[in-house]
Interface confidence: medium
Amino acid sequence: DTHKSEVAHRFKDLGEEHFKGLVLVAFSQYLQQCPFEEHVKLVNEVTEFAKTCVADESAENCDKSLHTLFGDKLCTVATLRETYGEMADCCAKQEPERNECFLQHKDDNPNLPPLVRPEVDVMCTAFHDNEATFLKKYLYEVARRHPYFYAPELLFFAARYKAAFAECCQAADKAACLLPKLDELRDEGKASSAKQRLKCASLQKFGDRAFKAWAVARLSQKFPKAEFAEVSKLVTDLTKVHTECCHGDLLECADDRADLAKYMCENQDSISSKLKECCDKPLLEKSHCLAEVENDEMPADLPSLAADYVESKDVCKNYAEAKDVFLGMFLYEYARRHPDYSVMLLLRLAKAYEATLEKCCAAADPHECYAKVFDEFQPLVEEPQNLVKQNCELFEQLGEYKFQNALLVRYTKKVPQVSTPTLVEVSRNLGKVGAKCCKLPEAKRMPCAEDYLSVVLNRLCVLHEKTPVSEKVTKCCTESLVNRRPCFSALELDEAYVPKAFNAETFTFHADMCTLSEKEKQVKKQTALVELVKHKPKATKEQLKGVMDNFAAFVEKCCKADDKEACFAEEGPKFVAASQAALA
């Protein structure tokens, strides 16, 4: 349905609070370096303009598209050229090219200082002094650091952030109340950002067919009692929502997400028995709850798939008639029967089935050719099963920190050209799969582990695309979305890599090491470990363990010394010399 004024339509649908929040997020995700005050000024101007359009949809400029209105506003920023360089060239373009240009300049790794958390009393004072500004600042700081964060979900995070302060700033022990809540929001926020980044990469790099396939598989696992037509309707709507958000159309995205939540709650009976408690909640919480809802129970009497997808003589006829629908039904039927499989595995099985039909339906005896197709699935299923089993055993044996170190060594040997900060970040996150998934029952381990690894490896792909250094990484990232994880798993030691020259500066440490948090200490040590492997890629596990144990002992000794800096100055070169000798 068309509206005379799109901006008025969205303002009325979303309400002023959500409208302003979403516009702030949109602007912060596009112009990530602009100061907070500049963005607030732009948002206020857009909001005032929207109100004039609500009052009179025929007023001047109210008929313009949101991209035109928002793009024009962004292009009024005076320091665009100095701050953003070539991004300023976007402003010379017309829509839709201008918006595409802004999208291409989104920076997944902006050069912004890490957010420092002030003292609790300082935060509570700021919250009480100006709650609205405090919450806007949160939206701004998160959005500029995570330019693909799912905007309507970020509003939900902001609501939780507000609730945490409202509750804890009244508490007797403010810090004990607030800090765990902020830690939880930070960790959940990072996870949410990374998951959304994979959705956007899927849409932007592999097209909406890839996203729809992912969504069919995931929603069929969640809603195994729903009919295929129902799942397909949800997939179509969900694809529209994520396409909009990934494309910077945040008002449309939030509006359509609300419509989808409404539809799901009005049609619970034909979707899932698990939606009831979500549907009693207010909008932001409801949408979040629906997105995270647990899998419904599988219908008891599902027949074997073989009859329709292998034994039937009509397989090729049905496939030829409407390939995507037939494959979609296959994926739906397989996924609803297998909540114990990762989505990526289900997509690999669908690809294998498609490849078999492409080959066999052109053969002399198609039925004979595809009769054993389900047997071909076995190795595809066993590979992630074995991977999860082996890595969970390793995690249980080593604990999280040492498991991360094993992965650091493994991935540095595979792709030593990748920057050390990226290898440390990605390997630390890969290592978190243990604590997240290995404690789960067998039936939940693979979907948890492999789908989490896909999210983490997408982060590697996104960072690598910005500054490509490894053909192997490019190949694994671009050839096939569903085979990214197996592609990285299959990489071996890079024999062509020329070891990095030894640089003593890299292994020089100072007394400031002693005041770091446990996490920061780990990152320092893991940074050194990556540099060691880049210097000696063929070093054995035992050699590396010896060096790292010595490193830990050296740091511990100097941090206990009276004159810490003198200790580091004296013991540091000894540690470096001993390490070189051990690795020679």
């Epitope: 179509t236 329709d308 009509d314 006829k317 049905n318 008639e321 629908v325």
Partner: nanobody, 128 residues
Framework: QLQVVESGGGLVQAGGSLRLSCAAS????????MGWFRQAPEKEREFVAG?????????DYADSVEGRFTISRDNAKNTAYLQMNNLKPEDTAVYYC????????????????????WGHGTQVTVSS
């Protein structure tokens, strides 16, 4: 919501022909059996014809229309058709299109309960 819309009904002389169309709002409907039912005044709704998923698959007809009516579908247009020839006064009824939810190999059911989505119907009147 998923929608089904019938068209093509009207008034026709006995012995004449009509072609009913049934348009589905979703591409995914090509994956399901489709059926035509009819309901004459003061009578129960009854099965007329059905076609299983995808063109060229199984068709099924009520004995009263066998040889006179032909069901077909055009998946590219998300549409099913009922070609009615040699119409009789007793064919007068509201004709309903319905879409089932069976696995792809399934035969089109005759039982109303196996059809989940229904149109509002189109009136067919055959005068003698």
């Amino acid at each position: 919501q998923l929608q089904v819309v019938e068209s093509g009904g009207g008034l026709v002389q006995a012995g004449g022909s009509l072609r009913l169309s049934c348009a589905a709002s979703e591409r995914t409907f090509v994956a399901y059996p489709m059926g035509w039912f009819r309901q004459a005044p003061e009578k129960e709704r009854e099965f007329v014809a059905g076609i299983s998923w995808f063109a060229g698959a199984t068709t099924d007809y009520a004995d009263s229309v066998e040889g006179r009516f032909t069901i077909s579908r055009d998946n590219a247009k998300n549409t099913a058709y009922l070609q009615m020839n040699n119409l009789k006064p007793e064919d007068t009824a509201v004709y309903y299109c319905a879409i089932s939810h069976q696995l792809p190999g399934g035969r089109p059911g005759r039982d109303m309960d196996s059809y989940s989505y229904w149109g509002h119907g189109t009136q067919v009147t055959v005068s003698s």
